[in-house]
């Protein structure tokens, strides 16, 4: 682990209570193909333990969704990945809207520091799929 | 190669016969910008030769497609990437539907073992594009 | 840097003049979370400085966009990432259309050589968002 190969791939555990837009994640071989090797989970949110540049990737699929599902609901459904703590480093890293689709997927390189906690906020009123091949979130340390 | 930097990027060769939803891939410098360095192809399917955590990525674009093409066809067009053999390890790793779009693209981290064969199943009745900048599939070993 | 860990993540600076479909990028810590460590910018286009296989990724979101924006405009909005110079190596690497969506995001592995300049061409008449969490472009050296 001294090489700094920190890596994690998480699956959706549950959504937050009504006023909390965060998705809550879980990981570990017992759950399927998710894992944490370096980063850790703090109440379902991913915390970074090693400084560096990371590849952050995410896919979120809406539950029992058709191309008309997203247009039925007034508030646009948007997914944002960001650093939510510490507050001094709070920033949105990656943002996507579903529009008339049922899945968003993207990835980006970003510098992260030890102690950064990443939040994935799903705004709107549509429930995400918990299928492990449809909704997942991960990070990979790529260089110092 | 002893470092375990196994990597492959493939281009679409052809679709399967009518009852076979699998996409058949090809790779090699003579074909364009595709390549196999470690993993190998077995009858158009990608076989892993080194244990580890891999970044799997895919983009599939439907041929001569407009936003109405996908909605015209009753059966939803879905792309699933999974381990199809050995049967004991069969699992869906990544799944996306086209809905009203013409392209899906995603990526995920997943543990793979030597001998795992990855299949990319395209269900529905729409033909994928064979353009090498529109449809491609790849894996990258990232850590043990 | 001798390890060959060349990496860059860029944010949109501006679009080109009317007949120039290229997006012009910028990077550096002073601008936000973008950076260049190895590759360099030449008049807003990304130039590779080390041979190898790279993971290229991009996300582009259209400005003030709704699912009807893209269907309102006759000419399809398409994003293509390619090598634009030297001319002898000119090729399209990755191409996506927006159809009824407002964001495209994808990634691929591709061999690049020192001196290759990557261009990102956005065809159509819709303006891309300059928000750093909505539009970004990056490369990561992954192996020789």
């Amino acid at each position: 682990e001294s090489l700094g190969w920190d890596i994690a791939e998480l699956q959706l555990n549950h959504t937050g209570p009504q006023q909390d837009p965060r998705l809550y994640w879980q990981g570990g071989p017992a759950l399927g193909r998710s894992f944490l090797r370096g980063p850790e989970l703090d109440k379902g949110q991913l915390r970074i333990r090693r400084d560096g540049i990371y590849m952050v990737h995410i896919q979120v699929t809406l539950a029992i969704c058709s191309s008309t599902s997203t247009s039925r609901h007034h508030h646009p459904t948007t997914l944002a990945v960001g650093i939510c703590s510490p507050a001094s480093r709070s920033i949105s890293l990656l943002r996507l809207s579903f529009h008339q689709g049922c899945t968003i997927a993207s990835q980006r390189l970003t510098p992260l520091a030890r102690g950064d906690t990443l939040c994935t906020n799903l705004t709107g009123t549509l429930l995400p799929s918990r299928n492990t091949d449809e909704t997942f979130f991960g990070v990979q340390w790529v260089r110092p | 190669e002893s470092l375990g930097w196994d990597i492959a990027e493939l281009q679409l060769n052809h679709t399967g016969p009518q009852q076979d939803p699998r996409l058949y891939w090809q790779g090699g410098p003579a074909l364009g910008r595709s390549f196999l360095r470690g993993p190998e192809l077995d009858k158009g399917q990608l076989r892993i030769r080194r244990d580890g955590i891999y970044m799997v990525h895919i983009q599939v674009t439907l041929a001569i497609c407009s936003s109405t093409s996908t909605s015209r066809h009753h059966h939803p067009t879905t792309l699933a990437v999974g381990i199809c053999s050995p049967a004991s390890r069969s699992i869906s790793l990544l799944r996306l539907s086209f809905h009203q779009g013409c392209t899906i693209a995603s990526q995920r981290l997943t543990p793979l073992a030597r001998g795992d064969t990855l299949c990319t199943n395209l269900t529905g009745t729409l033909l994928p594009s064979r353009n090498t900048d529109e449809t491609f599939f790849g894996v990258q070993w990232v850590r043990p | 840097e001798s390890l060959g860990w060349d990496i860059a993540e860029l944010q949109l600076n501006h679009t080109g003049p009317q007949q120039d479909p290229r997006l012009y990028w910028q990077g550096g810590p002073a601008l936000g979370r973008s950076f260049l460590r190895g590759p360099e910018l030449d008049k807003g286009q990304l130039r590779i400085r080390r041979d190898g296989i790279y993971m290229v990724h991009i996300q582009v979101t259209l400005a003030i966009c709704s699912s009807t924006s893209t269907s309102r405009h006759h000419h399809p909005t398409t994003l293509a990432v390619g090598i634009c110079s030297p001319a002898s190596r000119s090729i399209s690497l990755l191409r996506l259309s927006f159809h009824q969506g407002c964001t495209i995001a994808s990634q691929r592995l591709t061999p690049l050589a020192r001196g290759d300049t990557l261009c990102t061409n956005l065809t159509g008449t819709l303006l891309p968002s300059r928000n750093t969490d909505e539009t970004f472009f990056g490369v990561q050296w992954v192996r020789p």
Epitope: A63, I64, H74, R130 | - | -
Partner: antibody, heavy 120, light 111 residues
Framework: EVQLKQSGPGLVQPSQSLSITCTVS????????VHWVRQSPGKGLEWLGV???????DYNAAFISRLSISKDNSKSQVFFKMNSLQADDTAIYYC??????????????WGQGTSVTVSS | DIVLTQSPASLAVSLGQRATISCRAS??????????MHWYQQKPGQPPKLLIY???NLESGVPARFSGSGSGTDFTLNIHPVEEEDAATYYC?????????FGAGTKLELK
């Protein structure tokens, strides 16, 4: 406090139409969908349709030809209209709020119901 | 349409005992990692009241003696210990696809 209050006639002539208004309070129709369900001794609970926050409607295919659901967000009112009623449409008609998640299709608050008898 | 079959049609349970109600769907109502089955309670002269959603999630304000389980096509509502105020008719409802359908109901009486 979330409330749904229904108003409408108790008696409808055969082949005539039924109109019910559901006035809501404690939540906004620009955020939540409203379902219509009826209950009769013979057929139990039957889902009729829903109007979403956007004004888009989904109807039970069995009623689509004679059912219309609309709303006025500013008045917090949802309007239900069913045409060509027959005796077997005699039932209690309910409006009910869709829960927070739009794709969950579950009803967390219900109106008091409107008892409708179809008879000449 | 998905048909929901509830059993038994009625049952009588002593105070403090367990009541178990079953709901079987004509096809799976599980999708996207959830079980799209919900349970309501209805007392005479009142509208239905949501008890449990997504097979096992207790609606806010509902006592913990109510619990739900199941997946695919077979679902169960348990009430333990049964209290006097639990005398009512209980309905299952799926939301896997349109149209939404309900079970015919199970009437719970106290011995």
């Amino acid at each position: 406090e979330v409330q749904l209050k229904q108003s409408g006639p108790g008696l409808v002539q055969p082949s005539q139409s039924l109109s019910i208004t559901c006035t809501v309070s404690g939540f906004s129709l620009t955020t939540y969908g409203v379902h219509w369900v009826r209950q009769s001794p013979g057929k139990g609970l039957e889902w009729l349709g829903v109007i979403w926050s956007t004004g888009i409607t989904d109807y039970n295919a069995a009623f689509i030809s004679r059912l219309s659901i609309s709303k006025d967000n500013s008045k917090s009112q949802v309007f239900f209209k069913m045409n060509s009623l027959q005796a077997d449409d005699t039932a209690i008609y309910y409006c009910a709020r869709n829960s927070y998640y739009g794709n969950l299709y579950v009803m967390d608050y219900w109106g008091q119901g409107t008892s409708v008898t179809v008879s000449s | 349409d998905i048909v929901l079959t509830q059993s038994p049609a009625s049952l009588a349970v002593s105070l403090g005992q367990r009541a178990t109600i079953s709901c079987r769907a004509s096809k799976s109502v599980s999708a996207s990692g959830y079980n799209f089955m919900h349970w309501y309670q209805q007392k005479p002269g009142q509208p239905p009241k949501l008890l449990i959603y997504l097979a096992s999630n207790l609606e806010s304000g509902v006592p913990a003696r109510f619990s739900g389980s199941g997946s695919g096509t077979d679902f169960t509502l348990n009430i333990h210990p049964v209290e006097e105020e639990d005398a009512a008719t209980y309905y299952c409802q799926h939301s896997r696809e349109l149209p939404l359908t309900f079970g015919a109901g199970t009437k719970l009486e106290l011995k």
